[in-house]
Each structure stands twice: as C-alpha cells, then as structure tokens.
C-alpha cells in the first residue's frame, strides 16, 4: 500500500560575507531601523539563494539574526524539511557545496539573479554548520540580550556585563581574520549559580561547545579559553539574582602559536624541560595539533613524561578522545583529567627518537596540558624506590603504605617499615639505625652512618641531593649531611616554657605555640598550625562550603589558649591568600590540606612558634604516641571547648586502618587513636595538628585532623592528612 514519506527537519547554521556592504555600529542594535531593514534584505537574499538550488524544494524557514565585520558578515540559520532517507545525503558539507556552486555559477553572469539584486556574496566566505532545533531555541532565548563585539589586533576588550533583567545573554565575538580569540573569565564573587558556555562559532551550537563553566568555580577562579579562529560566542545563563556581575569577561585576538618542536635531550636523569599546549594555562583550542619530536642520547635511557592532574589511558573501540588524543610511537592514547600525578614512560628502542602528537579531537576542550619531560634509566627506572606500573610514578617501597593503587610496592617485603640487617635479613626498627648501638648481628645497622649512601625509602636527601642512612636526621643537633642541610631551618618545634578534644586535658600557655584557631566572625571553625613566618597549614575541607571560600572572612589567631578571653601572648592575622591542594577531593577527603598566607609575618615569642615540617622520607613509626590539640567538641555533637585541649593518640599502621575503614584510606592519610575510642579529635578540631616528638625534643607535624567516623567511637581511629604525603606541595608553595 501507499506509505507517506517521513519528513524530518534539518537545521543548519552559518555565515556569509557580503562584499558590497559595510558593517556599522547601528547593526549591533537589534532595535535600530538599520538592523531591521538590513535583516529584511539579508533574509530575502538568503531565502532566494537557497531556493535557487535543488534545496529549494525542501526549504522550510530561515532567519538572519546578526551582523559582523568583514566587510559585512551575516549570521543566519535555516531549516530544510527533507525526506528521512536523504538526511545523511544533505550534510552541512553537501549543503555548503551546493550553495557555493550556485554562487560561483552566477559570478560572471549578466542575467538578473534575485539574490544578487542588492548583495554581492563572496562564495569563499560561506560557512554552513550542523545545528539543531534546540540550538535555535537557545539562540532565540538570548536575542533580547545579544552583544556583538569586534576586537582588533593588539586590543584587549573588556566585555560589558550581562543585563540582569534578562535570563540569558550572548556575546558574539569577532577578531581579525587570521588570528584566534582568547577569552578570559574571572569569577569575582565567592559564590554564584551563573553558567557560562563558550562556543567556537557565532551562536550556541552544542556540537561546537568549547567548554562550559558553572557557579563561581573556586577550583578555577580564572579561566582562559581559546577559540580555533576569529569567531566565538559566549552564552550566559542567570543563576541567583545579583546586582553585581559575578564575573569579568575580556577578549583579545592572539596569533596562532606553532606547537611543533624538535629537541635533543641531555645525558642526565630527571626533568629537562616542559612541553605545553599553546598559551598554557589557557584551555587548548578546538583544533590544536601539537607534534613534539624528542631525541634520546642513548638507548640506555627511556623517555618519561610527567603530567600534573592528567593521565593517559588506552581508549576502547576507537571512540573519540574527549580530553585530548595522544599518539606516542603509533600508540593511540586518550587524555584524562584526574586528581593525581601521573607519568608515562616510553621505552626507547631506536635512536631515531620519539614523536609525540597531541590533538583535540572534538570541539570540547579543557585546561591546557603541560608535561615535564626527561630521561630515566631503562635498567633501573626508580633507584631505591618502586616503579608503580599503574601510574608510572616512583614510590617508596616497603614503608608500610600502599602508594601504588595495586599495592605491589608493599608486596614481597622482607622487612616492612623496618631496617633489614645485611647479615641475616632480620628486621630492626628504624630508630635503631645509626643510633650508635649495633643491633644487627655484625652491626650493619651502624655502618656507613657518616657517609653518603644510595637514596632509598628511608634515607634523608640533603640539599646537595646526596643521601644519608640515618633515619629522621633533621634538626637533631648533629649535622649528618656533608652540606649540613639536615640542620638548616631548625628554628621550629620547641614548646614554650610551660608547665577539648575527646578524652583530653587542658593545655597551658606556650605548650603548643604553633596551634592556630581559624575563625569566621568571631567563631572558631577549624584548627591549624604555624609552619613558617607567614604560613598556617590546615585542612582543605574547612573551606568546602562556598560561603567559607573567601579569604576576607577568616581571622587566624596564634598563641591562643582560651576561646572566650584574650591574653597578652595571643595575636591575630587576616588572610591574604588561601590555597587548597590542587588534588583535594571533597568526597574522598584525599589531599585534605590547605595553606593560608597571613597578611603580615609573625613575631616569634614563647607563645607563637612554628612546628617543624618533616622531610618526605621522615618515618613516623606506627605505635608511636603523638599528640593532637584543638578546641573541638568534647563529645560527639557537643559544643566546642573553651580551653585548648590536648590528647595523646597512637599511630596506627596503614593496612590496619585501611581494613577498619574498608579501604577508604589513601596514601595521603594517616590514622591514629585507640581501640577503646575515648581519645580522639572531634568537630572543630579539623585542620589542627597531630604532632610527634623526636628524640631531639623537637615536635614534627605528622598530620592534620581530617575525618573519622564520629568522635572517639570504639574501633574507629581518627584519620589525618599525612604530611609526608603532601610535603612537596607545601614546600613548593611556602618557598
């Protein structure tokens, strides 16, 4: 029987260049008569052009919605009603070809052509893109607040904020022909619900979305986005009503930056340089293609690529890479943003060198990618450490912490978190190494204590990069490093002359001179610890709520003991900078650390002194009794304590804590507490210090109060941020 043909709506968006007209500012105002008259003429021309081709039978509707420079560019959309079976045959490329063919056929024609009555259309300036009904609806919703801006070379144009009476606005941006646009977005409020989407074309085409950002992101207070060319659209959707713009937008044209390099690496290990996408840290542009060729000096070496918060993964089924495509020695890999460090190790088998390609496969992009490159020894990739095949990183082996996600760094250990005697492979505790008393059968624990040794898990690395065998040699009054660097920066960790955490006791003035009280509007919120003259360390989760993210809210008190009264020894500071660890993850509490820069340096006194920071290799022995301090609640759900409380807790091995917490404990966490509960941190202690006393009498920061199940509950230990796991970030920031 007869079957009616199914027709479908196919939507196209595009632009065309008119050579015999010039753009004027009047055409940016939709309410102007110039705009209305030009739109009517351009619309008529567009319809006539389409209907002059074999597309005419499918023509449904069209609209010219905007104009731009060049001499005059018209931006439009149109809909064709086409039989379903012809849908694929009328791709944007085919439609563009048909229209260009029509334009070319009449260029030298003397015959009267309707669409050429007023306009001389440039066939080379026609662009047709795929669109959808949804895209047109999104575009139409912005037309009441539509801003066109042309930005010239060398200009930085600050865009006028949105019209707050509108619910959505669109900035249509255009720059000089052979340049690319760089948009800068800066969030100016601590919290908002506004949404901004950036497109690589003149209108909000979902398939050409570069990125979208939402709600005054604290993770990215400033975002720079690159278009692939000289046109870009930014769409704003209103969040909460506000009289202040929660963001500032500015745009500038930039030249295309070549992303190709040939490098020959030196005959040395470790990082030798940086490769990055153009205009890093800007988002890479939708048509980025980088090609880096690296030549390795010898086949003894492999090439290592160290990434920050970005990893490479094999992609199944040849699906497109959504976060960047990499090809390394003909292997296709996809980039993936992660909250961890990562290294890709490339074995070198030929002297021809290695070519690394990076391509943005789709229009959706992301933060610029930067990678440190260097060499590693193929026969011993991680001297003294373990190569974690999961993430390519060198991690400490047999230290009692599963640093590698598969835990292989803690497998097959003869001595875990202890020293292995040479004589008979017996294990002795680390504090007994180089303590002047032989504990191994032939005294191998006391050998090489005055000389450099190969670096390993528990060796201390001196400033000159040599290593010493003695565990925890920092600030013990005896120089162990040739350069004396183990005794530098030692004005720390000493208690003042002095004599409620759950199960605790009241502290006295000067007993914990590094203890900080972090307050908002006179109310104690979190603890912290002074680690340098202008830096206080605390937990990142203290700033989890958007309302707590602004530095202006916080006051830091040092030298404080009582919350309800002040004494002469205490001092207060405003916060000039707040830095959360870039890998901090709220849900898992991983990397739960933040640094506060004080508005002026501290003046040290008996009541105000920094705590000592441990080296990455510092070993806090499980079983050791350390102390936590704070003004947190004295019982679960109770009010905070008036007096600074102190309580001793025992350090718990990682594997035991991990079992108790059903494997939610990461290598950046450390556990402490007791079977009986009773002694524990509680609400309000967050970010406060867990300190351990070294044999020298100095106190070292082992952890920060992070999380736990309730307070002082039996069978559940307190979980702390492990300082040795985040020390490299701390040192990077503070120095």
């Amino acid at each position: 029987g007869y079957k009616a043909e199914v027709m479908v709506s196919q939507v196209y968006s595009g632009s065309l260049r008119v050579l015999n007209r010039h753009f004027s500012q009047d055409l940016t105002r939709r309410e102007s008569s110039a705009f209305r008259s030009e739109t009517a003429k351009a619309q008529k021309m567009l319809k006539e052009l389409i209907t002059s081709t074999r597309l005419g039978t499918y023509y449904n509707s069209s609209s010219v919605y905007s104009f731009g420079e060049g001499p005059l560019t018209c931006f439009f959309w149109f809909i064709l009603q086409i039989p379903e079976h012809r849908r694929l045959m009328l791709s944007p490329e085919v439609v563009q070809a048909l229209l260009v063919e029509e334009l070319l056929s009449t260029v030298n024609s003397s015959a009267a052509v309707p669409y050429r009555a007023e306009y001389e259309v440039d066939p080379e300036g026609l662009v047709i893109l795929e669109a959808s009904v949804k895209d047109i609806a999104a575009l139409n919703s912005t037309l009441g607040c539509y801003r066109y801006s042309y930005v010239g070379q060398g200009q930085v144009l600050r865009l006028k904020g949105p019209d707050h009476l509108a619910s959505s606005c669109l900035w249509h941006l255009q720059g000089p022909k052979d340049l690319m646009l760089k948009l800068r977005l800066e969030w100016t409020l601590a919290e908002c619900r506004d949404r901004l989407a950036m497109y690589d074309v003149a209108g909000p085409l979902e398939k050409r979305l570069i990125t979208s950002v939402y709600g005054c992101s604290r993770q990215e207070p400033v975002v720079e986005v690159l278009a692939s060319g000289a046109i870009m659209a930014v769409v704003w959707k209103k969040g909460l009503h506000s009289y202040y713009d929660p963001f500032v937008l500015s745009v500038q044209p930039v030249v295309f930056q070549a992303c190709e390099v040939n490098l020959t690496l030196d005959n040395r290990l470790d990082s030798q340089g940086v490769l990055s996408t153009p205009y890093f840290p800007s988002y890479y542009s939708p048509q980025t293609h980088c090609s880096w060729h690296l030549t390795v000096p010898s086949l003894d070496y492999g090439l290592a690529l160290w990434f920050d918060a970005y990893a490479l993964r094999r992609q199944k089924y040849d699906l497109p890479c959504t976060q960047g495509q990499w090809t390394i020695q003909n292997r296709r890999l996809c980039g993936l943003r992660i909250l961890q460090p990562y290294a890709e190790r490339i074995p070198v088998v030929a002297t021809a060198g290695i070519t690394i390609n990076f391509t943005s496969q789709i229009s959706l992009t992301g933060p610029g990618v930067r990678v440190h490159y260097g060499l590693y020894n193929q026969s011993d990739p991680c001297p003294g450490e373990f190569l974690c095949s999961v993430n390519g990183l060198c991690v400490p082996a047999c230290d009692g912490v599963k640093d590698c996600p598969n835990g292989l760094d803690e497998r097959n250990c003869v001595c875990r978190a202890t020293f292995q005697c040479k004589e008979d492979s017996t294990c002795i505790s680390l504090p007994k190494v180089c303590d002047g008393q032989p504990d191994c059968l032939n005294g191998s624990d006391e050998e090489q204590c005055q000389e450099g040794v190969p670096c390993g898990t528990f060796t201390f690395q001196c400033e000159d990069r040599s290593c010493v065998k003695k565990p925890n040699p920092q600030c013990d009054g005896r120089p162990d490093c040739r350069d004396g660097s183990d005794e530098e920066h030692c004005d720390c960790g000493l208690q003042g002359p002095s004599s409620r955490i759950v199960g605790g006791a009241v502290s006295s003035e000067g007993e914990w001179p590094w203890q900080a009280s972090l307050q908002v509007r006179g109310r104690h919120i979190c603890g912290g610890a002074l680690i340098a003259d202008r830096w206080v360390i605390t937990a990142a989760h203290c700033f989890q709520e958007d309302s707590m993210a602004s530095t202006v809210l916080w006051t830091v008190f040092l030298g404080k003991v009582w919350q309800n009264s002040r004494w002469p020894g205490e001092v207060s500071f405003k916060v000039s900078r707040l830095l959360l660890h870039p890998y901090h993850e709220e849900d898992s509490h991983d990397y739960d650390v933040a640094l506060l820069q004080l508005d002026h340096p501290v003046v040290r006194s008996a009541a105000v002194r920094p705590v000592c920071l441990p080296a990455r290799s510092h070993f806090f022995e499980p079983g050791l009794h350390c102390w936590i301090t704070g003004w947190g609640a004295l019982r679960e759900g109770g009010p905070i304590s008036n007096a600074l409380q102190k309580v001793d807790v025992q350090l718990i091995p990682q594997d035991l804590c991990s079992e108790v917490y059903r494997y939610q404990v990461t290598p950046r966490m450390l556990c402490a507490g007791y079977r009986k509960g009773k002694k524990d941190a509680c609400q309000g202690d967050s970010g406060g210090p867990l300190v351990c006393k070294a044999l020298s009498g100095r106190w070292f920061l082992a952890g920060l109060v992070s999380w736990g199940l309730g307070c002082g509950r039996p069978n559940y230990f307190g979980v702390y941020t492990r300082i040795t796991g985040v020390i490299s970030w701390i040192q990077q920031v503070v120095t």
Partner: antibody, heavy 119, light 110 residues
Framework: QVQLVESGGGVVQPGRSLRLSCAAS????????MHWVRQAPGKGLEWVAI????????YYEDSVKGRFTISRDNSKNTLYLQMNSLRAEDTAIYYC????????????WGQGTLVTVSS | QSVLTQPPSVSEAPRQRVTISCSGS????????VNWFQQLPGEVPKLLIY???LLPSGVSDRFSGSKSGTSASLAISGLQSEDEADYYC???????????FGGGTKLTVL
C-alpha cells in the same frame, strides 16, 4: 620477631612475695601498653593488670588490687609484676602480653612462668 | 564467674561450620572491640580475631568474627582436627577499667 620472655616464677609460701619480669624485644617497647594475664591449672584465662605505654596509667583486677603492682622500665624494655601477700588462689601460669596497635588486646604472648603458692 | 558468657563446649564433624558465641553488656562488648584467642592443648594463647572481625596475618580465613549489639561470635568453617582447642573471647570493660575474658569454649572435632 616480637619476643616476650617471662622469668621469676617459682614456689612460694602464702603471704610471701615474688617479682616477675618480662623481657621484651623485636618491637618498640615504649610504644605499647602491656598486661599480665594468668591461667590457673585446668582453668580459663584471667586478666591481672595493665600498664600504659609510658607507665602513667595502671589498672588491676579486683582480687589483686592492693597486693600486686605492675611497673615497667622502658630503658630496659622490661615489664614487672610485684606480687605481695600471695594466696593459694594466685597459683597459675603468668603470661605477659603486649597490646597491639590502638590498644588492641594481646597480639603477642610470652611463654608464661609458673607461680605456685603453697605451704 | 565471668561476665562474658561463652558455651563451655561445642562439637562438630570435620569440614562443617561451627559458631561460638560470646555475650556481654553495653559497658564491654557494646562499646569496645572484641578479640578472640585460640589455645591449643599445652600451648600459649594465640590471637585469632581482633577489632571484632579482623584477621591477623598468618591466621586462616576459615576463621571469622562478627559482633552485633552486646554479643559477638566466632565462626570456623571447614573444620579440621587441628582446630581442636579452647577458644576465648576478650574485651575491655569501661566500668571495671579492665579486661574481661569469656569462660572459654572447648571445641571438639568429631
């Protein structure tokens, strides 16, 4: 490699005293709470006393309170039990036991020393 | 008389599963971690389960512990003749400020 070795047991008359020692090795003695546990012949286990890692806290089973004293010397890695006014019902094997991490009870035990109170 | 109650004896055939209970009160089992010990004839007690349900390294996973409210239990599956021993539960008691042992359960593998 944790080792606990008790000594000092023997036969003693009622009312007399005895001092038990427990030499510890293979772990950092000063980090862990220590206990004495006893077992009368053919009977079950009975806890006697505990001392905290730094010696600051001590607790006793009711029947030995005032007669027994637990102590430790962390510099010598040794645990002691001073038993005074001994009674026949104190006859038992006395074990010294080490707490585990977070004060988990008795993760290692000594071999025990027999104390016999008899006239 | 022990405040922690255990059955004096249990018996089961080889390869079967047996459960030993230990009941106490809120001041001990209800609020603290339970440990289980095995004492083979003529030997020193050995830690079998700690923190209610954790196995020390070297202990067979045929042993498992659990706790609910003021009662705890030890389960042994795939019984073997070498499992014949006395089994004790132990827990800290907050009101006594001391450790309580159960009276012990003698396991016989038939």
């Amino acid at each position: 490699q944790v080792q606990l070795v008790e000594s000092g047991g023997g036969v003693v008359q009622p009312g007399r005293s005895l001092r038990l020692s427990c030499a510890a090795s293979g772990f950092t003695f000063s980090n862990f709470d220590m206990h004495w546990v006893r077992q009368a012949p053919g009977k079950g286990l009975e806890w006697v006393a505990i001392i905290s890692y730094d010696g600051s806290d001590k607790y006793y089973e009711d029947s030995v309170k005032g007669r027994f004293t637990i102590s430790r010397d962390n510099s010598k890695n040794t645990l002691y039990l001073q038993m005074n006014s001994l009674r026949a019902e104190d006859t038992a094997i006395y074990y010294c036991a080490k707490d585990g991490y977070g004060s988990s009870l008795f993760d290692h035990w000594g071999q025990g020393t027999l104390v016999t109170v008899s006239s | 008389q022990s405040v922690l109650t255990q059955p004096p004896s249990v018996s089961e055939a080889p390869r079967q599963r047996v459960t030993i209970s230990c009941s106490g009160s809120s001041s001990n089992i209800g609020n603290n971690a339970v440990n289980w010990f095995q004492q083979l004839p003529g030997e020193v007690p050995k830690l079998l389960i700690y923190y209610d349900d954790l196995l020390p390294s070297g202990v067979s996973d045929r042993f498992s512990g659990s706790k609910s409210g003021t009662s705890a239990s030890l389960a042994i599956s795939g019984l073997q003749s070498e499992d014949e021993a006395d089994y004790y539960c132990a827990v800290w008691d907050d009101s006594l400020n001391g450790v309580l042992f159960g009276g012990g359960t003698k396991l016989t593998v038939l």
